[in-house]
Interface confidence: low
């Protein structure tokens, strides 16, 4: 038998993916475990194999359909169970009534690009990926810029309190290499959390023109 404290956390990407992490103190590394998803209002169910991500935690992605298909709504409940094999039978290790739109974590923004760059400013745009149409404009963003000699953790956060898929970075240093990241969060959901950070976008400000103060 597998004993110890269990933690089972899942997030819905708002379209067709539920990502789960199960951690179990004292769990056996060679135990075969799965996540089973049984929606209360749908004619499908789904399973994914939990794969180890650390000594005592496993993760998997429930792929519910094509990436942009709207597989769940705000009134869906999905019963999620962690099932682990014990010899010839399966034992339920964890269960939760999962409310998808209370537990949202969107995909990281994509297609970051420099729209326009000058000596002291840079206009950057991005797109959200696989985000439900249900949100309409009810999204917010956080962005951060990596300056030379600093770490991402030291970068101040810029908050965009509306669905604005661009930003104009100001007061930059001329002829300097920067990196930029953005993440997104729906306003809906008690346990909703920020998406992962986007892939960093590297850009360089233009050099200052000689003899001019730009």
């Amino acid at each position: 038998a597998v004993n110890g404290t269990s933690r089972f956390t899942c997030f819905y990407n708002s379209r067709a993916n539920i990502s789960c992490v199960w951690s179990q103190d004292g769990a056996l590394q060679d135990t075969s475990c799965q996540v089973h998803a049984w929606p209360d209002r749908r004619r499908w169910n789904q399973t994914c194999e939990l794969l180890p991500v650390s000594q005592a935690s496993w993760a998997c992605n429930l792929i519910l359909g094509t990436p942009d298909s709207q597989k769940l709504t705000a009134v869906d409940i999905v019963t999620l169970r962690v099932m682990c094999r014990e010899g010839v039978r399966w034992r339920m290790m964890a269960i939760q009534d999962f409310k998808p739109f209370e537990n949202l974590r969107l995909m990281a923004p994509i297609s970051l690009q420099v729209v326009h760059v000058e000596t002291h400013r840079c206009n950057i745009s991005w797109k959200i990926s696989q985000a439900s149409h249900y949100f309409e404009r009810h999204l917010e963003f956080e962005a951060r810029t990596l300056s030379p000699g600093h770490t991402w953790e030291e970068a101040p956060l810029m908050t965009l309190k509306q669905k604005q898929e661009w930003i104009c970075l100001e007061t930059l240093t001329p002829d300097t290499q920067y990196e930029f990241q953005v993440r997104v969060k729906p306003l809906q959901g008690e346990f909703t959390t920020w998406s992962p950070w986007s892939q960093p976008l590297a850009f360089r400000t233009k050099p200052a023109a000689l003899g001019k103060d730009t």
Partner: antibody, heavy 119, light 106 residues
């Protein structure tokens, strides 16, 4: 065969509390949500709330302050408790379950239990 | 809350007649359900997911619609169809029902 059997109805004083039971057979309440719906005499149907298979609940906001739905998995029974009853709570109270394709509407209903709120 | 408005509230038709009941939602819904309730009995599910016939329900019953407008039809009214019929939405909480349509035989 799926069956739902309500009990606990009867006469209740205004301001009093009501506790109903819904005994399920033919399925497990750890696998399906159980809903409560009521019908006042000569009136339509009103959804009150649900307890899901894992124990979480959703309530009609109009009743959230005085309604509690709970269950005992070992007895395969769901409980409905409403406080601060008034005359307009007089109704037949039903428990119901969705169909086998899960959420295919209320495919299974109890026979209902009549609650009369009167002094 | 989404209000469900059924019409007519009552109707009288002859055996063999085609009977149509409409249900108008105050905002768009994705799933519509129809129930039959005979006097003194619990409701019985007839139609789920707008147009699917529940198990054991005769094929003379049907449903259609989308958005805010839905229709329930009895293609050939039978004596045993005397009942009150309710629509119900299952798209947002609280789940809500129409006020009912009482069907009688002329």
């Amino acid at each position: 065969e799926v069956q739902l059997l309500e009990s606990g109805g009867g006469l209740v004083q205004p301001g009093g509390s009501l506790r109903l039971s819904c005994a399920a057979s033919g399925f497990s309440v750890t696998s399906y949500g159980v809903h409560w719906i009521r019908q006042a005499p000569g009136k339509g149907l009103e959804w009150l709330g649900v307890i899901w298979s894992g124990g979480s609940t959703d309530y009609n906001a109009a009743f959230i302050s005085r309604l509690t739905i709970s269950k005992d998995n070992s007895k395969n029974t769901v409980y409905f408790q409403m406080n601060s009853l008034r005359a307009e709570d007089t109704a037949v109270y039903y428990c119901a379950r969705a169909g086998d394709a899960n959420y295919d509407g209320f495919a299974y209903w109890g026979q209902g239990t009549l609650v009369t709120v009167s002094s | 809350d989404i209000q469900m408005t059924q019409s007519p509230s009552s109707l009288s038709a002859s055996v063999g007649d085609r009977v149509t009941i409409t249900c108008q939602a105050s905002s768009s819904v994705s799933f519509m359900y129809w129930y039959q309730q005979r006097p003194g009995k619990a409701p019985r599910l007839l139609i789920y997911d707008t147009s699917n016939l529940a198990s054991g329900v005769p094929s003379r019953f049907s449903g259609s619609g989308s958005g805010t407008s839905y229709t329930f039809t009895i293609s050939s009214l039978q004596p045993e169809d005397i009942a009150t019929y309710y629509c119900q939405q299952w798209s947002t909480y609280p789940l809500t029902f129409g006020q009912g349509t009482k069907v009688e035989i002329k």
